[in-house]
């Protein structure tokens, strides 16, 4: 068993069970759940004499941890005296110590109810310059209470002289006020009113509420990205739980496989959102082969605030497959932005919708943050399409004027990737690439070519690819500008872009 520090509990009798003429009385201290031996128990008896006896440690059956009791017998004016039991456990650390201070006996008492009330917002729903918190400690048997205010668990320096106590019948109530600046209140800190009474602690906490009521908790389970699956060959799936109210209860996420086979070790991350809610993500590495062969993975979510467990399942998408078509083009120079250009990539007619898009320059993959790619949208047919946008600088294109848009998709053959290159200055004859305004929509074509063939290869228009007037009879998608290049000795190919 690993090292475990003890839990310490005072042992006292009920005051009504101690005869009023008793000249001596015994109290005790229990140290339990520690490992290994030993613990050292000492007593502070104040001005009184006392004899102590520490019983041999016993082993707790289930855990193998130890428990021991130390007894203190005192005589004299014990009724008004407080006693401290000091437990040290050097195996935990050389300075590990727990002190418990208590009286000889415990009276029957009604514990207090602790409630924090806060001052209202103004009529417009805004916070005033100062916020008052009122701690109501009510309904307890009269006796000494200590009130402490905490800010994010740290004791605050507060003037407690304002605390007032009233008695109603046999029970007492006390209230303490804390004034905070608006800045402190809006800083999202937690304020706690902590009450110590009869050796017990009672508390209530409050903080600025979230700006909006969180919706019900939602859970989502992602499929692995094609890039992770086919290129990196280390696919992961992520279970995402959003809109949790922060609380003492933790979110429990359990992974399983429909086949019953064991799952890998998952990693977990918790993030507090600006609206006060909590987002929890758990990422599970999955086997490439397991995924491709159709294994179903399940994420089960439980939490005290969830009425019922939530289950999310994910597996490889079924249905027809179609490889993506990739078209890359550069926007023309725009007034006032000579040192920057936007490259665009249209990827379309792929199925299923899972796709990864990357941009490369100088054979190096650019960071994902450099480009912006839309979510897959359905085409009018049965496939999907995405657009990806990349901003490039003059320094980059002057270093090497070739940028590659690459799509990773399971239906692309032979290696699950399709890519097209695009240049900022493709050197088109006709010169409209350098135009100072957005060009009219045109079709680019070679003089000799009569039909529009399917794209067979290549990436950017060749200098022999001429810009011509748009032709309504030209086949192909009407919303795109298409360039046909006559390749020597090969099938012609298309380039889609702006001339």
């Amino acid at each position: 068993a690993s090292t475990q520090s003890p839990s310490v509990f005072p042992l006292t009798r009920c005051c009504k069970n101690i005869p009023s003429n008793a000249t001596s009385v015994t109290l005790g201290c229990l140290a339990t759940g520690y490992f290994p031996e030993p613990v050292m128990v000492t007593w502070d008896t104040g001005s009184l004499n006392g004899t102590t006896m520490t019983l041999p440690a016993t082993t707790l059956t289930l855990s193998g941890h130890y428990a021991t009791i130390s007894l203190l017998t005192v005589s004299g004016a014990w009724a008004k005296q407080m006693f401290t039991c000091r437990v040290a456990h050097t195996p935990s650390s050389t300075d590990w110590v727990d002190n418990k201070t208590f009286s000889v006996c415990s009276r029957d008492f009604t514990p207090p109810t602790v409630k924090i009330l806060q001052s209202s917002c103004d009529g417009g729903g805004h916070f005033p310059p100062t916020i008052q918190l009122l701690c109501l400690v009510s309904g307890y048997t009269p006796g000494t209470i200590n009130i402490t205010w905490l800010e994010d668990g740290q004791v605050m320096d507060v003037d407690l002289s304002t605390a007032s106590t009233t008695q109603e019948g046999e029970l007492a109530s006390t209230q303490s006020e804390l004034t905070l600046s608006q800045k402190h209140w809006l800083s999202d800190r937690t304020y706690t009113c902590q009450v110590t009474y009869q050796g017990h602690t009672f508390e209530d906490s409050t903080k600025k509420c979230a700006d909006s009521n969180p919706r019900g908790v939602s859970a989502y389970l992602s499929r692995p990205s094609p890039f992770d699956l086919f290129i990196r060959k280390s696919p992961t799936i992520t279970c995402l739980v959003v809109d949790l109210a922060p609380s003492k209860g933790t979110v429990n996420l359990t992974w399983s496989r429909a086949s019953g086979k064991p799952v890998n070790h998952s990693t977990r991350k918790e993030e507090k959102q600006r609206n006060g809610t909590l987002t929890v993500t758990s990422t599970l590495p999955v086997g490439t082969r397991d995924w491709i062969e159709g294994e179903t993975y399940q994420c089960r979510v439980t939490h005290p605030h969830l009425p019922r467990a939530l289950m999310r399942s994910t597996t490889k998408t079924s249905g027809p497959r179609a490889a993506p078509e990739v078209y890359a083009f550069a926007t023309p120079e725009w007034p006032g932005s000579r040192d920057k250009r936007t490259l665009a990539c249209l990827i379309q007619n792929f199925m299923p919708e899972d796709i990864s898009v990357q941009w490369l320059h100088n054979e190096v993959q650019l960071p994902d943050a450099r480009h912006s790619t839309t979510q897959p949208r359905k085409t009018k047919g049965s496939g999907f399409f995405v657009f990806s946008r990349l901003e490039v600088t003059r320094a980059e294109w002057e270093q090497k004027d070739e940028f590659i848009c690459r799509a990773v998709h399971e239906a692309a053959s032979p290696s699950q990737t399709v890519q097209r290159a695009v240049s900022v200055n493709p050197g088109l004859a006709g010169g409209s690439a350098q135009s100072q305004r957005a060009p009219d929509r045109v079709l680019c074509h070679s003089g000799q070519q009569q039909g529009l063939p399917r794209a067979a290869g290549g990436s950017v228009p060749h200098p022999r690819c001429h810009c011509g007037a748009g032709r309504a009879d030209w086949p192909g998608p009407p919303e795109l500008d298409v360039c046909v290049e006559e390749a020597e000795g090969e099938a012609p190919w298309t380039w889609t872009g702006l001339c």
Partner: antibody
């Protein structure tokens, strides 16, 4: 096998109270969220309340205040306390077990106990 | 709260017929639509969960489909024992929800 047996129903006067019990056997009660569903004679199913594995509970809007769900895992029993009974509470009350893996509905139902509210 | 609207409220059909019952949710359901069958004097029985997964022991003539807000239960070839009332349930509420059951569809003999 999994069994849920409801008891505690019967004829009660308006304004009275009842405590329905659901004895569970054949599975580990503490692993399952538990639900009470009721069905008025000739009508559809109506969700009343759910208690999760942590012992926290939720109620349908109309049930809040008069209905109290609780569970005692050591006794393998789930309870539904109904106060201030009204004629419209007349129904068969079903105790039901939510699937363990979650968000997949109710996989086992008791046979129900009939509550009749009438003067 | 998500409301579940089931239609039709009743349907008359013959043995061997294909019967489809629909259930519309007032908001999208991410996961967890269930279908139940109930016969007179009996508790409901789980048929389908997670939109389309057949519960244990349920004949393959029952199938569930749909996503978002539109769901359907289809009985491909109605059998004598299938004459009953069917309920859909939004089984995925992660917060307080009022009635999570549809109003029910009674499948009667024509």
């Amino acid at each position: 096998q999994v069994q849920l047996v409801e008891s505690g129903g019967g004829l009660v006067q308006p304004g009275g109270s009842l405590r329905l019990s659901c004895a569970a056997s054949g599975f580990t009660l503490s692993n399952h969220d538990m639900t009470w569903v009721r069905q008025a004679p000739g009508k559809g199913l109506e969700y009343v309340s759910i208690i999760n594995t942590y012992g926290n509970h939720w109620y349908a809007n109309w049930a809040s205040g008069r209905f109290t769900i609780s569970r005692d895992n050591s006794k393998n029993t789930v309870y539904l306390q109904i106060d201030s009974l009204r004629a419209e509470d007349t129904a068969t009350y079903y105790c039901a077990r939510e699937t363990h893996h979650g968000s997949s509905g109710i996989d086992h139902w008791g046979r129900g106990t009939l509550v009749t509210v009438s003067s | 709260d998500i409301q579940m609207t089931q239609s039709p409220s009743s349907v008359s059909a013959s043995v061997g017929d294909r019967v489809t019952i629909t259930c519309q949710a007032s908001e999208s359901i991410y996961s967890g639509l269930a279908w139940y069958q109930q016969k007179p004097g009996q508790p409901p029985k789980l048929l389908i969960y997670d939109h389309s997964t057949l519960a244990s022991g349920v004949p393959s003539r029952f199938s569930g489909s749909g996503s978002g807000t539109e769901y359907a239960l289809t009985i491909s070839s109605l059998q004598p024992e299938d004459f009953a009332t069917y309920y859909c349930q939004h089984a995925d509420y992660a917060h307080h929800s009022d009635n999570v059951f549809g109003g029910g569809t009674k499948v009667e003999i024509k």
